[in-house]
Interface confidence: low
């Protein structure tokens, strides 16, 4: 473990949901340290996570200044020796470049994952029920407020709606691109419910995991005649 | 002195899931990797898992699929859950810090502080 | 998966007396990622040494490392009466990071 060879980073991979995004690669750094950097296509580099020992740069607040621009990053391997405190170079002593490894190009509006939704409330009137998905907030600022994973996504988002009845097993669904469904039931039957996110124009991480299942009987439903 | 002191259920059933907690004290979850690893009864040390403060994990592939290893910065504790637990999941559940020191021109990886260890039994 | 061998399983010892323990490895390991534990009954592991041959504060000097590549040894030159437990290799370099079977090291 002498050696001061550095090693190039690999895997690198993006971890990605509702815009919480974290740069993640291999392998654990033996003489050498990590620094980060992060650009849209037509900007400069900007660097983060300086000389770490991890093998991870969370880049949430570089990428949702613009989630709908492409961003490009790369991870450096520094020799440990050049990465004393206070430099604020990445380069060694005669200013030749570390080893790099690019990413892959992120596009946080097309490939952040749709986190778990969850059902806020539901609320029997008669034999309608109105089923109520929390409009989640995301790291996606605008006007110093937090955007909700609606105002983000809009009509793009919808969520899908699986309902049954507690005693029996076959599922309905629902669609709605609110965060609202209005479904008719039988009265006198206890329903279950799971909701799904889903953004349909996408080809891939399309759709989110289901929600927790939600029953009537339970605490978060009202009933009212 | 750092301490990790760590709890969770003790006897579970089949197909249940397992779930423990280890807090750090007398230090911060920063600038660590935090395992948990498991040794059944007479048997050697089996790795489970790893977080880093920031939340990014590995996982030993033989449990992924049955794993879940979480961070809570505000409380200065890290946790474990096994799904869908089987007798073969009976074992001492360790937590530990997974230390990366630099020292004399390398780093070096080694857990050098545990949890005093839970007993887990799983039976019907 | 890198798997650690451990050899041999027991070892029958008096006090004073030297022991050697052996840990291979079926792929060649970065001494920076390779450490030795030991663990008396019913107590957690305690870490013993690092990077192969670096001893962890607190540990007495009889006990030291050596090797690299495949093959690593921990030597505990005098055997006290507290030193008779089961001795674990470890290597946290490659996922899964693993251990090694164990060296049971028992009074003679």
């Known amino acids: 473990s002498g050696t001061t060879n550095t090693v190039a980073a690999y895997n690198l991979t993006w971890k990605s949901t509702n815009f919480k995004t974290i740069l993640e690669w291999e392998p654990k750094p033996v003489n050498q340290v990590y620094t980060v950097q992060i650009s849209t296509k037509s900007g400069d580099w900007k660097s983060k996570c300086f000389y770490t020992t991890d093998t991870e740069c969370d880049l949430t607040d570089e990428i949702v200044k613009d989630v709908k621009q492409t961003y490009l990053a790369r991870v450096f391997s520094v020799p440990w020796r050049n990465s004393t405190h206070g430099k604020e170079t990445l380069f060694g002593t005669h200013g030749e470049e570390p080893p790099f490894t690019n990413a892959r190009k992120f596009l946080p509006y097309r490939d952040t994952k749709l986190g778990q939704p969850t059902i806020q409330s539901f609320e029997q009137v008669g034999t309608k029920v109105n089923v109520t998905v929390e409009d989640e907030r995301t790291l996606v600022r605008r006007n110093n407020t937090f955007l909700s994973l609606r105002d983000v996504f809009g009509k793009d988002l919808i969520y899908t709606l699986y309902y049954w009845k507690s005693s029996s097993s076959g599922k309905k669904t629902a669609k709605t691109n609110t965060n609202e469904f209005l479904i008719d039931v039988d009265k006198g039957e206890n329903y279950c419910f799971s909701v799904q996110a889903v953004i349909p124009s996408r080809t891939v991480n399309r759709k989110s995991t289901d929600s927790p299942v939600e029953c009537m009987g339970q605490e978060k439903g009202e009933f009212r005649e | 002195q750092v301490q990790l002191q760590q709890w969770g259920a003790g006897l579970l059933k089949p197909s249940e899931t397992l779930s423990l907690t280890c807090a750090v004290y007398?230090?911060?979850?920063?600038?660590?990797?935090w395992s948990w690893i498991r040794q059944p009864p007479g048997k050697g040390l089996e790795w489970i898992g790893e977080i880093g403060a920031s939340g990014s994990t590995r996982y030993n592939p033989s449990l992924k699929s049955r794993v879940t290893i979480s961070v809570d910065t505000s409380k200065n504790q890290f946790s474990l859950k096994l799904s869908s637990v089987t007798a073969a999941d009976t074992a001492v559940y360790y937590c530990a810090r997974d230390t990366p020191y630099y020292y004399e021109g390398g780093y070096y990886y080694y857990m050098d502080v545990w949890g005093k260890g839970t007993t887990v039994t799983v039976s019907s | 998966e890198i798997v650690l061998t451990q050899s041999p399983g027991t070892l029958s010892l008096s006090p004073g007396e030297r022991a050697t323990l052996s840990c291979r490895a079926s792929d060649s390991v970065d001494s920076s990622y390779l450490a030795w534990y030991q663990q008396k009954p019913g107590q957690a592991p305690r870490l013993l040494i690092y990077g192969a041959f670096s001893r962890a504060n607190g540990i007495p000097d009889r006990f030291s490392g050596s090797g690299s590549g495949t093959d690593f040894t921990l030597t505990i030159s005098r055997l006290e009466p507290e030193d008779f437990a089961v001795y674990y290799c470890?290597?946290?370099?490659?996922?899964?990071?693993?251990f090694g079977g164990g060296t049971k090291v028992e009074i003679k």
């Open positions: 007398g230090g911060s979850l920063s600038g660590y990797y």
């Open positions: 470890q290597q946290a370099g490659v996922v899964p990071y693993t």
